[in-house]
């Protein structure tokens, strides 16, 4: 950056190199060039010469004043016009930054995605700070009183192998940057209560032509959690409002759920699950589309599958959702 140049003098910022956005600031430039009494001192911001609010303080020093500085980052340098020199002579440069102190982190959430081997902790960082802001996640065992700290710039994945202090912990987050420091409330967790089952996916749909046609949705998960509660939501693609059905599920078998839907309408389905009685849900699964037939039966699939867990037969769909390989997202 601009700070790596060889200086023939000194440049400094008041109140500081990193300051609160919207402040009035002064940038000072002092020349120390051999055999040069500067005729004029010039300031440049991001390579563009500044023309206003420059005050000469003495023979070697000048000040540039900015009112209500709102740029997150700027590179400043200053030059001198020396007698007998055709070009301006570089004095020095400095990168400056403006931003905000961190907000108090809130909505601290820690979950263990099944099979991940990690406890993932996230929080709402609040408003954008514009400057480098670090977070320290504190994890304190309620059984051993031992505390571990993890430094990060966003969320944190903590290996469950490193959580050796039993099952109950306090978690809190400290946010800090050059302009301030804040600390969240403490979250109390029990490791057994924060597991989110492996992603549920909808694999295919078929509409059976009966007196009242019915649509069967086939859905599945890799989870080995025994008691799982799930919700399936569905709506016509033209509608705004979702219908929701609830299920208590054991994924020993592929799940089959029946719906009585209007003919010749395109529907969209999603599913999500949680360990029964626990706090956190999976994010909703990818969108799965199925158009009900006018009269003839229709299958939204490329192959059929028996409904035993280890059948070995295959499933494919023509759903056009978006892929999320480890299914992280909203968990509230």
């Amino acid at each position: 950056g601009i700070t790596n140049i060889n200086c023939s003098g000194h440049i400094w910022v008041e109140p500081a190199t990193i300051f609160k956005m919207g402040m009035n600031i002064s940038i000072y430039c002092q020349a120390a060039i051999k055999n040069c009494q500067p005729r004029k001192l010039h300031f440049y911001k991001n390579g563009i010469k500044e023309r206003f609010q420059i005050t000469r303080i003495n023979k070697t020093t000048a000040r540039l004043w900015y009112k209500n500085f709102l740029e997150p980052h700027a590179s400043m340098y200053c030059t001198a016009e020396c007698p007998k020199h055709f070009q301006e002579t570089l004095i020095c440069g400095k990168d400056i930054s403006s931003g905000y102190p961190p907000d108090i982190p809130d909505e601290v959430t820690c979950v263990i995605y099944e099979y991940s081997g990690n406890m993932t902790c996230t929080w709402n960082a609040g408003k954008l700070t514009y400057i480098d802001t670090k977070y320290v996640v504190h994890v304190k065992s309620l059984e051993t009183e031992e505390e571990q700290q993890y430094l990060t710039s966003s969320y944190i994945n903590i290996s469950t192998d490193s959580l050796q202090g039993g099952k109950k912990y306090l978690v809190w987050v400290q946010a800090a940057n050059a302009l301030g420091m804040e600390e969240s409330k403490q979250l109390q967790i029990h490791l057994d209560d924060i597991v989110i089952p492996s992603a549920a996916v909808i694999s295919r749909a078929e509409t059976i032509n009966a007196t009242v046609p019915k649509t069967i949705i086939y859905w599945d998960s890799q989870t080995t959690i025994e008691k799982v509660s799930c919700e399936m939501r569905y709506k016509a693609t033209t509608n705004q409002t979702w219908n929701v059905k609830e299920f208590d599920t054991n994924f020993t078998y592929v799940q089959q759920s029946e719906f009585y839907l209007e003919p010749n309408i395109k529907y969209v389905f999603q599913v999500r699950c949680q360990e029964t009685g626990k706090r956190y849900w999976q994010p909703w699964s990818s969108l799965f589309f199925h158009k009900t037939p006018e009269t003839v039966p229709q299958v939204t699939s490329k192959a059929f599958q028996h409904d035993t867990w280890n059948s070995g037969l295959t499933v494919a769909s023509i759903s056009t959702g978006h892929l999320t390989s480890d299914n992280r997202g909203d968990i509230g």
Epitope: V201, T314, L323, D326
Partner: nanobody, 121 residues
Framework: EVQLVESGGGLVQAGGSLRLSCAAS????????MYWFRQAHENQREWVAR???????TYADSVKDRFTISRDNAKNTVYLQMNSLKPGDTAVYYC???????????????RGQGTRVTVSS
């Protein structure tokens, strides 16, 4: 259509080793997570190991430091190296995979038929 075929099971003495393989074939655009599960009794499946597409691995506590999962993305194959086997490891071992069959579709779950591993004392 996607098939998963396991191989490498068999009878082994306690303390011995086996290497299981599971090859995926068919309409595959991309395989994300791949898993090994085992089932000693009906309706009692147990997760063994998981490997992500980037080869990050996690293991059940019961097999940690004894089993190693690996994969070859070019061959759409996942492996399970099982060392220091115990009679309690006796089960049918299944591989499963989160597969995208084309670039537009969400991933689907596919499962193999399983290969039997018997550990004698």
């Amino acid at each position: 259509e996607v098939q998963l075929v396991e191989s490498g099971g068999g009878l082994v003495q306690a303390g011995g080793s086996l290497r299981l393989s599971c090859a995926a074939s068919g309409s595959i655009f991309r395989i994300n997570n791949m898993y090994w599960f085992r089932q000693a009794h009906e309706n009692q499946r147990e997760w063994v190991a998981r490997i992500t597409r980037e080869s990050d691995t996690t293991y059940a506590d019961s097999v940690k430091d004894r089993f190693t999962i690996s994969r070859d993305n070019a061959k759409n194959t996942v492996y399970l190296q099982m060392n220091s086997l115990k009679p309690g490891d006796t089960a049918v071992y299944y591989c499963t995979a989160d597969v995208q069959t084309n670039s537009r579709d969400a991933q689907q779950i596919f499962r193999g038929q399983g290969t039997r591993v018997t550990v004698s004392s």
